[in-house]
Interface confidence: medium
């Protein structure tokens, strides 16, 4: 077959080809941020000619045009300025209310480079209705102005714009509106990953639950599905493998799904994962009926084995068949478990559809969704048992209407998204599962998203301010206990003057707590070996502080997981009979273990903990420290096996004020404290008043930098003695 001509450049932009210049290949244009390509794509026909979808002429010159945001169509009970037909990127629109009305939402909104407005819908409300005024999102027209119980409003878009969200919303019992807020978008607009991750994550992490079922908190974040720890989730991952998805993009679909699977198995709920790839026909790679669907390794390996070539004979996009195979799976499981049983009725179901475009065969996918809703008996009371996420990738040829129709509609949440490319998808999946918003004491959860604050990334991190001393750091290990270093408290015992500063979402300065009780290891005595020529000795450098009140768990305050506890065992997804030794073998499992500590300025810094023979060579440079240890004969007199060692090569060194802070590792997207910062041979902050300024040691420094951290695996008896009724310890 003839190939298509190569004179298809776009001025100011670039293009990619799904299958080279051969017939069937999709040419996709892209432009720099703030511009969009017109046309968006072309298809190489078997005749060897390029076809532009929806165009009358076959080959108009491709150009990059400036993105614009839609204008408000109307605004009730107030005025907006300036009044333009559409707005350029960076342009603002401001809203003001008439007397007697209060503005809710954003008073000023800016047009973003993706053609979407930042902020929230501005609404002028006088609070007269049973439900609050649902507002008129920019670009939409609202019909209906009564907000009594059971009243409905409907939304419409101007010509050329596509509605996403709910066209019709009804005022419900309790004052909330059904469905999700609509918006009208230009066909070229798409979502930024940094918006999708939290929106998707808010919805999803609530469904993943680990939330405390007895807590009824009403938060603007949206509902929290109360899956108890014993609850069960069926996750169905549907991966588009049709011809317009290039092999490379399919790999990223797979990788993103793997990220999702990996992360979802780090939650303390029972989950079964189904994997379905589809083009003209679906192919079930893993069914929730298979016991392996509960095993992360099996699920990941079935994903890895998903082959792009599985669908080379049928290249269409049959989304209906893919969703129908989910329906059939549900039907089989229902028959197996029994329709009336709690075992069936208590399963939550989440479907994630990753597609690059519109279904073009097999009938309307909406029909399959209706069947699924019916079999799961989804009604207002059981709305939380099904979530369908429709994610379109490759912003330019995705059918907004179809995605919108498929995605669930829940108040304060979004389930339908369009991303610019597979790279953006990967970013979203990396950051979406953020359980840091959960309110119970689940341990070792830090917000890993790119825009999280330092405290959100390490919410266990606290600052300790003893009287007239340099501050120290510490780590929350429960909602009332802090683990830190004993040497922070060697002057005086009056802890009534000490303060512990804990992260707080309401204040960038945190919240101060008084100390009810300080437990300082009796074995700690910095001068214990002075007569041996060891001027300072840091054995047993460990302390516990009990705070005067419990800390309210939040995005900014949450305990880290302590190894050798049941809590850590759950987070590591280890079997029930695991021991402390098992944890040590899993966490400190190689000669050089990457770990972190938190700097004075709150950022997370990297170190490598040296184990085995590397520990010996790491520690032995202490013998060159003639000031602190003038006549040291045996390094082990100073560096006992209570210490972990770091500070070689590119490691950061902790500063003096960072003592007591956690030395922690990341496993399965959860964080585990294996040590606490104790002492070292080099202070990178010496002579600098700037918290952000650390100087690495000169490469010629003698002795070279080394840092020593109390190894929590060696302090088990003491930890158990004082925390036995706070944490659930595993056998040694």
């Amino acid at each position: 077959a003839p190939s298509c001509p190569q004179n298809v450049n776009i001025s100011g932009g670039t293009f990619t080809l799904s299958h080279g210049w051969a017939p069937g290949s999709l040419l996709t244009y892209s432009c720099p941020q703030g511009l969009y390509p017109s046309p968006a794509s072309r298809l190489c026909k078997s005749s060897g000619q390029w076809q532009t979808p929806g165009a009358t002429r076959s080959l108009s010159k491709a150009v990059c045009k400036p993105v614009r945001c839609p204008a408000p169509v109307s605004f009730e009970n107030g005025i907006y300025t300036p009044r333009l037909g559409s707005y350029p990127v960076g342009g603002n629109v401001s809203f003001e209310c008439e007397d007697g009305f209060i503005l809710r939402g954003s008073p000023v909104r800016q047009c973003r480079p993706n053609g979407m407005w930042d902020g929230e819908t501005a609404v002028c409300d006088n609070g007269a209705g049973y439900c609050s005024n649902p507002g008129i999102p920019i670009g939409t027209r609202k019909v209906g102005s009564q907000y009594r119980l059971e009243d409905s409003v409907t939304y419409h878009c101007s010509r050329g714009l596509t509605l996403r969200g709910s066209q019709r919303r009804t005022c419900q019992e309790g004052g909330s509106w059904s469905g999700t807020e609509p918006s009208c978008q230009d066909p070229y607009s798409y979502d930024f990953p940094e918006d999708v991750a939290p929106a998707l994550g808010t919805s999803f992490s609530h469904m993943l639950g680990a939330t405390n079922p007895t807590q009824k908190t009403k938060e603007s974040l949206g509902r929290k599905i109360q899956i108890q720890r014993s609850g069960h989730l069926n996750l169905y991952l549907l991966l588009d493998c049709s011809q317009s998805v290039s092999e490379n993009d399919f790999l990223i679909f797979k990788e993103s799904a793997s990220l999702m699977v990996d992360r979802i198995f780090s939650f303390e709920i029972n989950v079964s994962v189904a994997i379905i790839t589809f083009a003209s026909e679906p192919k079930v790679l893993m069914s929730v009926l298979n016991d392996n669907s509960r095993d992360m390794t099996e699920v990941i390996s079935s994903l890895e084995n998903a082959n792009y070539k599985d669908h080379e004979n049928g290249t269409g996009t049959n989304t209906y068949a893919a969703l129908n195979s989910v329906y059939l799976m549900m039907n089989n499981q229902m028959r197996l478990l029994g329709m009336e049983t709690m075992a069936w009725q208590e399963i939550r179901h989440a479907i994630i559809l990753l597609t690059d475009g519109k279904s073009n065969m097999g009938g309307s996918p909406k029909t399959a969704v209706d069947h699924i809703r019916e079999i799961l008996n989804i009604n207002q009371k059981r709305n939380d048992y099904l979530d369908i996420y429709a994610i379109g990738v490759g912003k330019l040829d995705v059918d907004w209407r179809e995605l919108n129709e498929l995605g669930s509609k829940k108040d304060g949440e979004r389930h339908a998204f369009i991303l610019q490319d597979t790279k953006a998808l990967h970013q979203v999946f990396e950051h979406m599962l953020d359980v840091s918003k959960l309110t119970d004491t689940i341990c070792g959860v830090g917000n890993m998203s790119a825009n999280a604050s330092d405290q959100e990334r390490t919410p266990w991190h606290v600052t300790i301010k003893p009287k007239s001393q340099e501050t120290c750091r510490g780590a929350l290990i429960s909602d009332q206990w802090v683990l830190t270093a004993a040497h922070c408290f060697r002057d005086g015992n009056d802890h009534s003057l000490w303060r512990v500063n804990v992260g707080d979402p309401k204040s960038q300065w945190g919240k101060e707590f008084l100390i009810e009780k300080a437990v300082i290891s009796p074995g700690f005595d910095v001068f214990a070996k002075k007569n041996q020529g060891i001027l300072e000795f840091y054995g047993d450098d460990i302390a516990l502080l009990k705070l005067a009140q419990k800390v309210k768990m939040s995005t900014h305050a949450r305990p880290i997981c302590l190894p050798c506890t049941m809590e850590a065992n759950l987070a590591l997804r280890r079997p029930q009979g695991s021991t402390c030794r098992d944890h040590e073998n899993e966490l400190l499992n190689k000669q050089s273990v990457p770990a972190h500590f938190v700097a004075l300025n709150g950022s997370k810094l990297n170190i490598n903990l040296k184990m085995g023979v590397e520990w010996t060579s790491c520690a032995e440079v202490v013998s060159q420290e003639k000031t602190m240890f003038p006549n040291l004969t045996d390094v082990r007199e100073v560096v006992t096996d209570q210490f972990l060692c770091s500070g070689t090569q590119e490691d950061e060194s902790p500063c003096k004020g960072e003592s007591g802070g956690a030395v922690f590792l990341e496993r399965r997207f959860r964080f585990f404290q294996v040590g606490l910062v104790s002492w070292g041979l080099y202070n990178p902050c010496l002579g600098s008043a700037d918290k952000n300024s650390r100087k690495r040691a000169p490469r010629s420094k003698v002795p070279p930098p080394r840092d020593f951290h109390i190894n929590l695996f060696r302090m088990q008896p003491w930890l158990r003695q004082h925390l036995g009724d706070v944490l659930n310890f595993l056998p040694l």
């Epitope: 650390r694 100087k695 490469r699 003698v702």
Partner: antibody, heavy 118, light 111 residues
């Protein structure tokens, strides 16, 4: 006052070796790394490698690995750089330079001209 | 290796005028909160002389008309008011990791 005094100019035949010395004074020799840098006539500066006089550990530019050898004699506070298998393109001024606390070259020797010619 | 590219290769500036030399690194030279980029001045027949260390710190004894700025990969050496004795070749050099490398040099002449 910190001083680095290098040995005199050398003329060598291709294939031969040359050993340049650098005597340090005015500071504790083992406290700072010594680096070697060369500069061909009218050309830029090229880093050869460095040595930590305390541990006698070295770091080399891959380009010179196997041909350059850096050593020290702590007792006389002197650093040495030997370059073997000389070629005409090795004709250059060779400098020793002492690193400071910021790993910058704060002090330099006067330079030693090595000429490789048949 | 981290390649340092200086621009321009040469420039001529009048006495009392400002001279600016740029240095771009192929990889970031920032670590531990500092930029490990240094600037040297070399006059014919002499070894180089350190002017600026860690991107922006003036070595003691160096006139304060010399200043350095930049972070990550882009750095600038500025001479605020050119004096006759500033005619020389200027080099940037990084010490972020081994191997250390130098820029190709910028020759500064008096107009």
């Amino acid at each position: 006052e910190v001083q680095l005094v290098q040995s005199g100019a050398e003329v060598k035949k291709p294939g031969a070796s040359v050993k340049v010395s650098c005597k340090a004074s005015g500071y504790t020799f083992t406290d700072y790394n010594m680096d070697w840098v060369r500069q061909a006539t009218g050309q830029g500066l090229e880093w050869i490698g460095d040595i930590n006089p305390n541990y006698e550990s070295t770091g080399y530019n891959q380009k010179f690995k196997g041909r350059a050898t850096m050593t020290v004699n702590k007792s006389i506070s002197t650093a040495y750089m030997e370059l073997s298998s000389l070629r005409s393109e090795d004709t250059a001024v060779y400098y020793c330079a002492r690193e400071d606390d910021h790993d910058a070259f704060a002090y330099w020797g006067q330079g030693t001209l090595v000429t490789v010619s048949s | 290796d981290n390649v340092l590219t200086q621009s321009p290769d040469s420039l001529a500036v009048s006495l009392g005028e400002r001279a600016t030399i740029s240095c771009r690194a192929s990889k970031s030279v920032r670590t531990s909160g500092y930029n490990y980029m240094h600037w040297y001045q070399q006059k014919p027949g002499q070894p180089p002389k350190l002017l600026i260390y860690l991107a922006s710190n003036l070595k003691s004894g160096v006139p304060d008309r010399f200043s350095g700025s930049g972070s990550g990969t882009d750095f600038t050496l500025t001479i605020s008011s050119l004096q006759a004795e500033d005619a020389a070749t200027y080099y940037c050099q990084h010490s972020r990791e081994l191997p250390y490398t130098f820029g190709q040099g910028t020759k500064l002449e008096i107009k």
